[in-house]
Amino acid sequence: SSVRTWSPNSAVNPHTVPPACPEPQGCYLELEFLYPLVPESLTIWVTFVSTDWDSSGAVNDIKLLAVSGKNISLGPQNVFCDVPLTIRLWDVGEEVYGIQIYTLDEHLEIDAAMLTSTADTPLCLQCKPLKYKVVRDPPLQMDVASILHLNRKFVDMDLNLGSVYQYWVITISGTEESEPSPAVTYIHGSGYCGDGIIQKDQGEQCDDMNKINGDGCSLFCRQEVSFNCIDEPSRCYFHDGDGVCEEFEQKTSIKDCGVYTPQGFLDQWASNASVSHQDQQCPGWVIIGQPAASQVCRTKVIDLSEGISQHAWYPCTISYPYSQLAQTTFWLRAYFSQPMVAAAVIVHLVTDGTYYGDQKQETISVQLLDTKDQSHDLGLHVLSCRNNPLIIPVVHDLSQPFYHSQAVRVSFSSPLVAISGVALRSFDNFDPVTLSSCQRGETYSPAEQSCVHFACEK
């Protein structure tokens, strides 16, 4: 646990039992801000959550402490270590001076909290532009103007060939100075990120002579997702969706290359479907066949009625608030024309069920249905547009006979999930069920996908 974070057990000797944070309220951290203000959002950085809690129960309430004396409860929040929790506070409408973060997880670590004001807050009227200071090791000469005002370019003229230099940038606001930025190391006379030459030995994948993210070659000279860079200096182009299936994008670009099927496997898309909730606005049959390549997965969508139902099924007959209160379960069954031994199930999303009001990720429960109508549970899986399509591997219990799967059942609890396709991935030219049925004196022929008689040549 870092000295820069707060945790319920941070004050406790590591050799003693950490304090419990008993239900219903648990432990809480109270933070006060320098200036009371009408908030637009609250951001909290969490650096550790116990695995027992996952993301869902660690923060069981956040209270805003209003100047009026009112405590405004924001309720339970889902927290993650890789993304700060941001809560929009559009309807608070009164000055807040502090917060209380309640937790049932004695190991939870909180690094920072930031209250952002609404626009045109009187506190910001006196704000001055930020200044920047460049620091070097070895130090710059005293007479070098290392403080930058409105221009953001610093030229160092005092360099010796072959010498190693490290640079940091410090932000200055009024009389306050920030922590130094991460260092950049430069050997005078050798290449660097931004010189237009790709130094592979320094980990550069591209160099477009600038330090801008989002143009295909990142600030650290790394090639960005969905871009391809060629030549020196690098010229980068956005290849995903340009209609040309290039070799390097076969595994990643559904738009250009269709769904990637690894060698030795066969992907079968649903040939029929049945769903729990449908009407003329959201028919279940749209998930039959391969998903439309043009569909990009969208997150935090609350109105799915615009242009989704032609490409994907979602349970449009039930509103989001209703489904939450009624705890409705939605399901779809995808049927496949050729029952096979499943290697994986592939689920294509158009929306991942996330709701802008919280950070909870939706999960789906997946089952395989075999030709004897037996169900085989593949467990719960988290949905995310970052991980789309969702590929669920099928692990076979080798102490049990193999089975042919004829359908997949997917169930979930949010009407904000839209599914555009379901595939059954099986082994190409290899059927374990048939293989295991070969008699003595027979061998499995991949070409004929059946057992064939063989005789040993002596």
Partner: antibody, heavy 123, light 107 residues
């Protein structure tokens, strides 16, 4: 027929609490949701929250979070709405309204309304 | 919160007239819109749910249409008992919100 009968008018002092009841008849109480809505004089209707009368699950408008509590007594087929820390702005007519079926919704909206309970907050 | 804006805020009409009231949501609400009628001193009455479905017992002169953000309530031939205030309400997201109301008055 389906009917919702609410408790009588209340006069309260600022800082006090009020509890309004809503007795349902003519349908299976636990199969439906119950909304609470208020209307201040000359103002638009304002949704406060709702309860799944079967499970007791609730959801409140953030504006009232921490001040409002919606409960139900299934044996009496009655829903309750309690509002605490009353202030003069809470002077309004408070309505309960039956929401959709929690089992198989065929209709949405607030189908049936109580007659309303006038709550006056004054020092 | 989703803001619901009704227009006009009031309309003067005669018996037999066709009256149209519009309701605009600040963001898409799919089909989840209801219309209510309220008379002075009375509780509101549900007319239409899910944009266009007529509540049981409501006369067929009332109809609703729209999707996404723009919705309409139409009274095809105004009757004496229709003079009242009409509210739209979204139930696509929390908190459920109502429009400011449209008062239909006798010309």
């Amino acid at each position: 027929q389906v009917q919702l009968v609410q408790s009588g008018a209340e006069v309260k002092k600022p800082g006090a609490s009020v509890k309004v009841s809503c007795k349902a008849s003519g349908y299976t109480f636990t199969s439906y949701a119950m909304h609470w809505v208020r209307q201040a004089p000359g103002q638009r209707l304002e949704w406060m929250g709702w309860i799944n009368a079967g499970t007791g699950a609730t959801k409140y408008a953030r504006k009232f979070q921490g001040r409002v509590t919606i409960t139900r007594d299934t044996s009496a087929s009655t829903a309750y709405m309690e509002l605490s820390s009353l202030r003069s702005e809470d002077t309004a007519v408070y309505y309960c309204a039956r929401g959709p079926s929690m089992e198989t919704p065929t209709t949405y909206g607030m189908e049936v309304w109580g007659q309303g309970t006038t709550v006056t907050v004054s020092s | 919160d989703i803001q619901m804006t009704q227009s006009p805020s009031s309309v003067s009409a005669s018996v037999g007239d066709r009256v149209t009231i519009t309701c605009r949501a600040s963001q898409g609400i799919s089909r989840w819109l209801a219309w209510y009628q309220q008379k002075p001193g009375k509780a509101p009455k549900l007319l239409i749910y899910s944009t266009s479905s007529l509540q049981l017992g409501v006369p067929s002169r009332f109809s609703g249409s729209g999707s996404g953000t723009d919705f309409t309530l139409t009274i095809s031939s105004l009757q004496p008992e229709d003079f009242a205030t009409y509210y739209c309400q979204q139930e696509n997201d929390y908190p459920f919100t109502f429009g400011g109301g449209t008062k239909v008055e006798i010309k």
